[in-house]
């Protein structure tokens, strides 16, 4: 018979014949032959493979390094990787949560638009005209300038995105 050019699902083509893939949690030891089945072996402790595969080495479980602010959210199995997350008060530094850092602060002139969570950093926004922030903070929003008029005062010094206005008494003409 003609050798196959394509194989069924969960099979792979090698040496002009279709061999069974190894199931999740197992690695390939030897390809099948005309007379023998594919030989697979279970992944060792702290290893995994999450798909039907022909890998000769299992993948290492991710290590949730406490020195990087990480802790185990879900322990790995022979078929799944360990899932890490950040300690309280820290957030992931990337999509795969490879490590964690303390939440970013918004510099003076910027306010917090969105407070950080375990998976996302602080989002800062520039203080618009009429608002200011004079501190570096991970939770403070931009504050509105003081309204001198409501205090029956006048603006003596204009505000900026980093400083509040300075109010002073109105100059009154003497009789």
């Amino acid at each position: 018979p003609e050798p196959p050019t394509a194989c069924r699902e969960k099979q792979y083509l090698i040496n002009s014949q279709c061999c069974s893939l190894c199931q999740p949690g197992q690695k390939l030891v030897s390809d099948c032959t005309e007379f023998t089945e594919t030989e697979c072996l279970p992944c060792g402790e702290s290893e995994f493979l999450d798909t039907w595969n022909r890998e000769t080495h299992c993948h290492q479980h991710k290590y949730c390094d406490p020195n990087l602010g990480l802790r185990v959210q879900q322990k790995g199995t022979s078929e799944t990787d360990t899932i890490c997350t950040c300690e309280e008060g820290w957030h992931c530094t990337s999509e795969a949560c490879e490590s964690c850092v303390l939440h970013r602060s918004c510099s003076p002139g910027f306010g917090v638009k969105q407070i950080a969570t375990g998976v996302s950093d602080t989002i800062c926004e520039p203080c618009p005209v009429g608002f200011f922030s004079n501190v570096s903070s991970a939770f403070e929003k931009c504050h509105p300038w003081t309204s001198c008029e409501t205090k029956d005062l006048v603006v003596q010094q204009a505000g900026t995105n980093k400083t509040d206005v300075v109010c002073g008494p109105q100059d009154r003409l003497r009789a």
Epitope: D50, K62, G69, T93, S94, E98, V101, R104, D121, I123
Partner: antibody, heavy 115, light 112 residues
Framework: EVQLQESGPGLVKPSDTLSLTCTVS????????MSWIRQPPGKGLEWIGA???????YYASWAKSRVTISVDTSLNQVSLKLSSVTAADTAVYYC?????????WGQGTLVTVSS | DIQLTQSPSFLSASVGDRVTITCQAS??????LAWYQQKPGKPPKLLIF???NLASGVPSRFSGSGSGTEFTLTISSLQPEDFATYYC??????????FGQGFGGGTKVEIK
């Protein structure tokens, strides 16, 4: 063994697309971010972009219009495509595991842009 | 992108010297900063991340400090194998549309 290996043509013509592949072993691409970095001869490191463990892509502002990073988890490969290349794109191109904490690097591959 | 300004660009020193390299970020990146060592013809090697945490197998003469926008790498007593180029790298990440990343320009540590 945990390792990375870049591969691709060492010579690319101006205005063509540079295509590189990074083949990984010993860890799962779905669990790590992968970055591409380049280094022009005699110069410093330049971040090109990254692909997250969940598939999100992140590009340096200079690269946004020209770069595509993709991943094929079944082949354990991450690819980089850089279009409309010029002589200024001549560099050693590295793939690395991670985002800021780049704890594992390939040996790098030199790509020369020349006609 | 995040701009990281490294200084000095070049540094001549002798074995046993204490060496300090600084890295300034254009915006607050918390402690999300790494330091790398690179030797000619080789890929960079991770020394420190985040900011002050030594990577596995890195000698204790290396130390890092700083947070926010100002960071420092110190080699307490320079050894012959430490003559190399050092890079800082840092950034932040919130989502695909809100992130920053970059490398410093490098500091070449040469033999005096």
């Amino acid at each position: 063994e945990v390792q990375l290996q870049e591969s691709g043509p060492g010579l690319v013509k101006p205005s063509d697309t540079l295509s590189l592949t990074c083949t990984v072993s010993g860890f799962s691409l779905s669990s790590y971010d992968m970055s591409w970095i380049r280094q022009p001869p005699g110069k410093g490191l330049e971040w090109i972009g990254a692909i997250g463990g969940a598939g999100g892509t992140y590009y340096a502002s200079w690269a946004k219009s020209r770069v595509t990073i993709s991943v094929d988890t079944s082949l354990n490969q991450v690819s980089l495509k850089l279009s409309s290349v010029t002589a200024a794109d001549t560099a050693v191109y590295y793939c690395a595991r991670g985002w800021t904490r780049l704890d594992l690097w390939g040996q790098g591959t030199l790509v020369t842009v020349s006609s | 992108d995040i701009q990281l300004t490294q200084s000095p660009s070049f540094l001549s020193a002798s074995v046993g010297d204490r060496v300090t390299i600084t890295c300034q970020a254009s915006e607050d990146i918390s402690s999300n900063l790494a330091w790398y060592q690179q030797k000619p013809g080789k890929p960079p090697k991770l020394l420190i991340f985040p900011a002050s945490n030594l990577a596995s197998g890195v000698p204790s003469r290396f130390s890092g400090s700083g947070s926010g926008t100002e960071f420092t790498l110190t080699i307490s007593s320079l050894q012959p194998e430490d003559f190399a180029t050092y890079y800082c790298q840092g950034g932040y990440w919130t989502s695909t549309s809100n992130f920053g990343q970059g490398f410093g320009g490098g500091t070449k540590v040469e033999i005096k």
